[in-house]
């Protein structure tokens, strides 16, 4: 890892990524763009899955936040050898699929995808991938696209949550590089604290959630401030102020001396949530403190 | 809870056309999360899957290869049901026919009672 | 497509551990599902999403996916899970089952 920026956002992070023919001569650009991307992300909570597609979609490696299970990862992914054609579909519905079976029961972590593609999508192929991004939208994933020479950035729009969520690289391959900061810098969404960090048991106190990327929501309206209470019950409040670098939110009375609440946040009314390890606990308080 | 009833003729013809229904109780056909699809079983071919349809703002169908040229899956809103249509059928579709629930479009968990469909002049 | 292959059967006496293979090629990368089929009814899910249980299935259930094989492993064995078992994975438009396990309690 080289330093510089990171992520420390707990959420499902899926890169979707053409190995159709016409990436051949290129596929090594495009595994050192994932596998530096991959190396910014570094919250033990974070897991990570590998997708690729051409005339069917294949998923390298299920999600995992075992760091050693990345690494071998990452190694399948540099033996790819490219062929075929630009089914972009199957890989959405592979991530789909995972989403799907991994939050099934319960709580739902966060997902975002990031779908690599080289080439314009014609018509019934078009049709498809949007289809099935909308699917994984409608489970509750953030989709990023990332549009690498002759691809048609209209069409990427649609298949990625707006305009701002496609990252043209015009220059090649060889430019994919250029665009590791963007994108880690609109992908990641993370908790980085809580002030207050402690609370008086049964008073009603507003928390300034600290962070980066809570903006990044389709709609900020739909953006929540989640506390889960002693690792039981969860509590979702609605901010009231949303901006890119903090959250005001109104914190839930917790009744006794020494409860915790975790933080977490949804983006997507409660559809699903961003991790983090931070913690606000609840100490006594005399009249006058 | 949720439950599945078929209905449908148990005995059809070489060349004709195999229509089954499947009434959807306690969930709705037009469900945002699931889709709605027909398996069959027979002893020669174990369990096949033919088909499904999922609403996500219109309406979408996915067939087997199988089938493709010959089957149609409809649903009926107004009667919250869906139905199977299997043209120019042969012997070899002989089978016990399934509908089932697919919450997510991708597993089936919750299967109708069956129907024997023989196909014999 | 993936292909899935099980043993016609496997036999366990009562209380112990039975285990169903389901073979396919770098079936890892897919997702394996497994149903329950009693005489003259309809298959039953037991596993989903490689190991995950639906609600009312019993905690002896289980089930991994590693390599080119999912196993569905039935701990402490009872007569009620004599039954045929079946493997199934969704791989590109398409849902493809094993030919099924008939598991027979001794």
């Known amino acids: 890892e080289d330093g510089g920026p990171a992520c420390y956002g707990g959420f499902d992070l899926y890169f979707i990524l053409d190995k159709s023919g016409s990436v051949l001569h290129h596929w090594n650009e495009i595994y050192y763009f994932v596998e530096q991307l991959a190396h910014k992300f570094i919250s033990p909570q974070l897991r990570m899955s590998f997708i690729v597609f051409s005339t069917r979609g294949t998923t390298l490696m299920k999600l995992t936040e075992d760091r050693e299970q990345i690494r071998q990862g990452l190694e399948e992914l540099q033996k790819v050898l490219p062929g075929g054609d630009t089914y972009m579909h199957e890989g959405f519905e592979r991530a789909s699929e995972q989403i799907y079976y991994e939050n099934r029961q319960g709580y739902r972590t966060a997902s975002v995808i990031i779908a690599l593609t080289d080439g314009e999508l014609h018509e019934d192929l078009f049709f498809y991938s949007e289809r099935e991004a909308n699917r994984s939208r409608d489970l509750g994933a953030i989709v990023y696209c990332v549009g690498v020479k002759d691809f048609n950035e209209t069409q990427l729009a649609r298949i990625a949550d707006s305009k701002d969520h496609v990252f043209p690289v015009n220059d090649g391959f060889q430019a994919l590089q250029g665009i590791i900061h963007s994108i880690l810098k609109k992908s990641c969404i993370e908790i980085l604290a809580a002030e207050p960090s402690t609370i008086c048991a049964g008073e009603s106190f507003q928390v300034v959630v600290r962070g980066n990327g809570f903006r990044h929501a389709r709609n900020v309206d739909r953006v929540l401030c989640s506390f889960k209470i002693n690792d039981s019950v969860t509590l979702n409040e609605k901010p009231f102020s949303v901006e890119d670098t903090y959250l005001l939110c109104p914190a839930p009375i917790l009744k006794e001396v020494g409860m915790k609440a975790a933080l977490q946040v949804s983006m997507n009314d409660g559809l699903s949530f961003i991790s983090s390890s931070v913690i606000i606990t609840t100490t006594h308080c005399s009249d006058g403190s | 809870q949720v439950q599945l009833q078929q209905s449908g003729p148990g005995l059809v013809k070489p060349s004709q056309t195999l229509s089954l229904t499947c009434a959807i109780s306690?969930?709705?056909?037009?469900?945002?999360?699931?889709?709605w699809g027909w398996i069959r079983q027979s002893p020669g071919r174990g369990l096949e899957w033919l088909g499904r349809?999922?609403?996500?703002?219109?309406?979408?169908?996915d067939y087997a290869v199988s089938v493709k040229s010959r089957i149609t899956i409809n649903p009926d809103t107004s009667k919250n049901q869906f139905s199977l249509q299997l043209n120019s059928v042969t012997p070899e579709d002989t089978a016990v026919y399934y509908c089932?629930?697919?919450?997510?479009?991708?597993?089936?968990?919750?299967w109708g009672q069956g129907t024997l469909v023989t196909v014999s002049s | 497509d993936i292909e899935l292959t099980q043993p016609p059967s496997v036999s366990v006496a009562p209380g112990q551990t039975a285990r169903i293979s389901c073979s396919g090629d770098?079936?890892?990368?897919?997702?394996a599902h497994w149903y329950q089929q009693k005489p003259g009814q309809a298959p039953v899910l037991v596993i989903y999403?490689?190991?995950k249980r639906p609600s009312g299935i019993p905690e002896r259930f289980s089930g991994s996916n590693s390599g080119n094989t999912a196993t569905l492993t039935i701990s402490g064995t009872q007569a009620e899970d004599e039954a045929d078992y079946y493997c199934s994975s969704y791989a590109s438009h398409d849902y493809v089952f094993g030919g099924g396990t008939k598991l027979t309690v001794l």
């Open positions: 770098n079936i890892r990368s897919y997702y």
């Open positions: 349809i999922y609403y996500r703002s219109k309406w979408y169908n």
């Open positions: 089932a629930r697919m919450p997510g479009g991708f597993l089936f968990d919750l």
């Open positions: 306690g969930d709705s056909v037009s469900t945002n999360g699931a889709a």
């Open positions: 999403g490689d190991s």
